[in-house]
Interface confidence: medium
């Protein structure tokens, strides 16, 4: 099988405050086995935005039902965007392990927040 690629097709997304932002991500293979996570920022201080496997992320929904093997689309929607949500979001594939280890990251999508229309 070809090596898995993590594809974030949008370099940037601009959303008005109060609206929802859709961040696109697809992977090209099921292998290596393991989950997808979304982060804002890079490096050790990055913020976990969504973990496919576990956790409670009330503002985040998956665009497709990615807990099943219907597809390899791991796009997310973040509701009620505020200026504090601005930043670069990374879709990251993990390899299953004890603990799971990072395998490959997408190139990132920069989210900018416009003022709420008056």
């Amino acid at each position: 099988e070809e090596e898995l690629q993590v594809i974030q097709p949008d370099k940037s997304v601009s959303v008005a405050a109060g609206e929802s932002a859709i961040l696109h991500c697809t992977v090209t293979s099921l292998i290596p086995v393991g989950p997808i996570q979304w982060f804002r920022g890079a490096g050790p201080a990055r913020e976990l935005i969504y973990n496919q496997k576990e956790g409670h992320f009330p503002r985040v929904t998956t665009v497709s039902e990615s807990t099943k093997r219907e597809n390899m689309d791991f796009s997310i929607s973040i509701s009620n965007i505020t200026p504090a949500d601005a930043g670069t979001y990374y879709c990251v594939k993990f390899r299953k392990g004890s603990p799971d280890t990072e395998f490959k990251s997408g190139a990132g999508t920069e989210l900018s927040v416009r003022a709420k229309p008056s």
Partner: antibody
Framework: DVQLVESGGGVVRPGESLRLSCAAS????????MSWVRQAPGEGLEWVSL????????YYADSVKGRFTISRDNSKNTLYLQMNSLRAEDTAIYYC???????????????WGLGTPVTVSS | EIVLTQSPGTLSVSPGERATLSCRAS??????LAWYQQKLGQAPRLLIY???TRATDIPDRFSGSGSGTEFTLTISSLQSEDFAVYYC??????????FGGGTKVEIK
């Protein structure tokens, strides 16, 4: 009720080909990955191949890689296994099995067909 | 490739007794393990997944335990319909998907 019905098995000579089919009903076929698992006479279970829901991803056991091709037709709710260059060691009952896992990257089998026998003999 | 070793190969048990089947993995598979039952001339049936979760419509006399490399399937009180071959299967890492060699539970 979930039903998986295999067909297409038979007796062939080494080097020949066979195409197995599995007709699925009782669930949304296009929402689930599907696999073929085989069992040689008196032996245990051996996973053969898996196909993702839309058919884009196909995975094989080393023992059949390059000889077998898994495919599906979601409009017909049917899974296929094209078996070429058959060998005596491919003799087995071939089961069609539905994915039952909760995470897209896990794979176990919550429903199985009754199997179709394949005999490769000169 | 992760290898699953089941023991014993054959287990002779009287009806009503407890049966304990073992499955050992060659490396840590966390709790990513399923158990199947196969009666003679029939297709396998899923009993347990995630090491300890019973599948739909499986009686509670069947229970799974263990994690890492050591797993156990316990049948608390064997019924006549439980005499069969039992297989474990891991889904920690694949391909390939691998099964254990099976344990035959026969009437003593």
């Amino acid at each position: 009720d979930v039903q998986l019905v295999e067909s297409g098995g038979g007796v062939v000579r080494p080097g020949e080909s066979l195409r197995l089919s599995c007709a699925a009903s009782g669930f949304t076929f296009s929402n689930y990955a599907m696999s073929w698992v085989r069992q040689a006479p008196g032996e245990g279970l051996e996973w053969v191949s898996l196909i993702t829901t839309n058919g884009d991803g196909a995975y094989y056991a080393d023992s059949v890689k390059g000889r077998f091709t898994i495919s599906r037709d979601n409009s017909k709710n049917t899974l296929y296994l094209q078996m070429n260059s058959l060998r005596a060691e491919d003799t087995a009952i071939y089961y069609c099995a539905k994915d039952g896992a909760a995470h897209y990257y896990d794979i176990f089998f919550d429903y199985w067909g009754l199997g179709t026998p394949v005999t490769v003999s000169s | 490739e992760i290898v699953l070793t089941q023991s014993p190969g054959t287990l002779s048990v009287s009806p009503g007794e407890r049966a304990t089947l073992s499955c050992r993995a060659s490396q840590n598979v966390r709790s990513d393990l399923a158990w199947y039952q196969q009666k003679l001339g029939q297709a396998p049936r899923l009993l347990i997944y995630d090491a300890n979760t019973r599948a739909t419509d499986i009686p509670d006399r069947f229970s799974g335990s263990g994690s890492g490399t050591e797993f156990t399937l316990t049948i608390s009180s064997l019924q006549s319909e439980d005499f069969a071959v039992y297989y474990c299967q891991h889904y920690y890492d694949w391909p390939p998907v691998t099964f254990g060699g099976g344990t035959k539970v026969e009437i003593k």
